[in-house]
Interface confidence: medium
């Protein structure tokens, strides 16, 4: 019979013969022959292969370097790589999460719209009229000015986006 020029899915062509690929989590030790099947071996403890393959070496699991602010989000298996994420207070610099940067704080006059996560930075927003933030913070939102009226007081000093209003007693008019 004619030697094959193409093989089925999960097979590969070698020496004019179709051999089975190794399943995910295993590496190739030796190609099949006319008389023997493909020989595969499981990947080692800190290794993986995530596809049907003919690789002779497994890939090393990713190392989540704590010195870069990284920690393990999901431990790798023989078929999957380790997934890293950032320590609380930090976020990834890329989708691959190879390093982390510190979450930024929102300056006075700006409040936290959304607190940072492992993959996204703090989102700040300017405090609108009637709201203020007087500190630089990664957690503080814009807060409404004090309502002097509800305390039976009057505004002595107007508020800004960085300062609260100052309330004072109402002037009593003498008869």
């Amino acid at each position: 019979p004619e030697p094959p020029t193409a093989c089925r899915e999960k097979q590969y062509l070698i020496n004019s013969q179709c051999c089975s690929l190794c399943q995910p989590g295993q590496k190739l030790v030796s190609d099949c022959t006319e008389f023997t099947e493909t020989e595969c071996l499981p990947c080692g403890e800190s290794e993986f292969l995530d596809t049907w393959n003919r690789e002779t070496h497994c890939h090393q699991h990713k190392y989540c370097d704590p010195n870069l602010g990284l920690r393990v989000q999901q431990k790798g298996t023989s078929e999957t790589d380790t997934i890293c994420t950032c320590e609380e207070g930090w976020h990834c610099t890329s989708e691959a999460c190879e390093s982390c940067v510190l979450h930024r704080s929102c300056s006075p006059g700006f409040g936290v719209k959304q607190i940072a996560t492992g993959v996204s930075d703090t989102i700040c927003e300017p405090c609108p009229v009637g709201f203020f933030s007087n500190v630089s913070s990664a957690f503080e939102k814009c807060h409404p000015w004090t309502s002097c009226e509800t305390k039976d007081l009057v505004v002595q000093q107007a508020g800004t986006n960085k300062t609260d209003v100052v309330c004072g007693p109402q002037d009593r008019l003498r008869a």
């Epitope: 320590e87 207070g89 940067v101 939102k141």
Partner: nanobody, 121 residues
Framework: EVQLLESGGGLVQPGGSLRLSCAAS????????MQWVRQAPGKGLEWVSS????????YYADSVKGRFTISRDNSKNTLYLQMNSLRAEDTAVYYC??????????????WGQGTLVTVSS
């Protein structure tokens, strides 16, 4: 010199309560973001809760939401963690931490020596 001194830990039965305190000194406490983190035996650091400088905004890990309350008294330079409905999985060393404002290998630039909380019957 920045110092954070935790207290209030101890042995408590499941369902019980504890109040942790953290006395801060050596920095301007009333403008600092503060947090509680914990480390269970043989585990890594886990964030528990954060509070903004004025104490108006608080955030909690899902595992403690509804059971723990973070608060602060800026006049006393003290951070608190009220822990209710304690569970065995809350057993850990609890650290008070000042949120970092500069880059470095961790989200905290200062933290205390920790106080041990053991939840067991």
């Amino acid at each position: 010199e920045v110092q954070l001194l935790e207290s209030g830990g101890g042995l408590v039965q499941p369902g019980g309560s504890l109040r942790l305190s953290c006395a801060a000194s050596g920095f301007t406490f009333n403008v600092a973001d503060m947090q509680w983190v914990r480390q269970a035996p043989g585990k890594g650091l886990e964030w528990v809760s954060s509070i903004s400088p004025n104490g108006w905004d608080t955030y909690y890990a899902d595992s403690v939401k509804g059971r723990f309350t973070i608060s602060r008294d800026n006049s006393k330079n003290t951070l608190y963690l009220q822990m209710n409905s304690l569970r065995a999985e809350d057993t850990a060393v609890y650290y008070c931490a000042k949120h970092a404002s500069t880059e470095g290998p961790t989200a905290f630039d200062y933290w205390g020596q920790g106080t041990l909380v053991t939840v067991s019957s």
